[in-house]
Amino acid sequence: VPRSSSPDWAQCQQLSRNLCMLAWNAHAPAGHMNLLREEEDEETKNNVPRIQCEDGCDPQGLKDNSQFCLQRIRQGLAFYKHLLDSDIFKGEPALLPDSPMEQLHTSLLGLSQLLQPEDHPRETQQMPSLSSSQQWQRPLLRSKILRSLQAFLAIAARVFAHGAATLTEPLVPTA
């Protein structure tokens, strides 16, 4: 894969860091909670994109061909954007007007676009099928989705930090 298809790692690093902060602000867990608790068998139960060993997001995988990992991150961002667009976040109880959700949504879109090469066809992907949620379910669903997003973004940010540190092409000084 030619280097030209690589993203702007530094910009991705900055955006992903910002996204981590926004996701945290959108749902700072209560002190007693076991942070980012994920059950080992959860991934078999839902189609949530998770960054796993076989996705090539490790240092060697990124060096060999970063596109596999970037595709996985793109899928994850699209998946969560779809959830943030759903009635879980749009319906009652209404989110506070100063909620960071709008910023989070915009930044997810921004990072997705940064990772989507101009000539790259949009990937078709299994999106979560959400039956209409009841009002009492939404606060719980929001919490679970945002904590899952936090875990996803934390790994994505580490990938971009590594990419920015090791895969960014050095500037060639002009004569």
Partner: nanobody, 123 residues
Framework: EVQLVESGGGLVQAGGSLRLSCAAS????????MAWFRQAPGKEREFVAQ????????YYADSVKGRFTISGDNAKNTVYLQMNRLKPEDTAVYYC????????????????WGQGTQVTVSS
């Protein structure tokens, strides 16, 4: 394994009151939210009331709004359901449930359930 133990059920006349309690057996267990559900004979289990500890927000089914009050002690993982102006249609087995904070949202939102306590309202 955490057990949720309900108590306070019984037989009461229409218009009367009952207070249900539910406590987690493991004191180290921490929940994100706790709730009450009920199941009447031949019917599906239905949501009654919920408390989310962070922020203390509460939610009620329309059928119990203004009559039932959910409260609790987060530190003790104990939740209560004060039921006033009871009606015969409130007759059901009442279940306590707790959400431990898993991130899976495609399964049951609540991952711990009690055995239930019977509430019978006679007319």
């Amino acid at each position: 394994e955490v057990q949720l133990v309900e108590s306070g059920g019984g037989l009461v006349q229409a218009g009367g009151s009952l207070r249900l309690s539910c406590a987690a057996s493991d004191r180290t267990f921490s929940s994100y939210a706790m709730a009450w559900f009920r199941q009447a004979p031949g019917k599906e289990r239905e949501f009654v009331a919920q408390i989310i500890w962070s922020g203390g927000s509460t939610y009620y089914a329309d059928s119990v709004k203004g009559r039932f009050t959910i409260s609790g002690d987060n530190a003790k993982n104990t939740v209560y359901l004060q039921m006033n102006r009871l009606k015969p249609e409130d007759t059901a087995v009442y279940y306590c449930a707790a959400d431990s904070g898993r991130t899976d949202w495609t399964a049951d939102l609540y991952d711990y359930w009690g055995q239930g306590t019977q509430v019978t309202v006679s007319s």
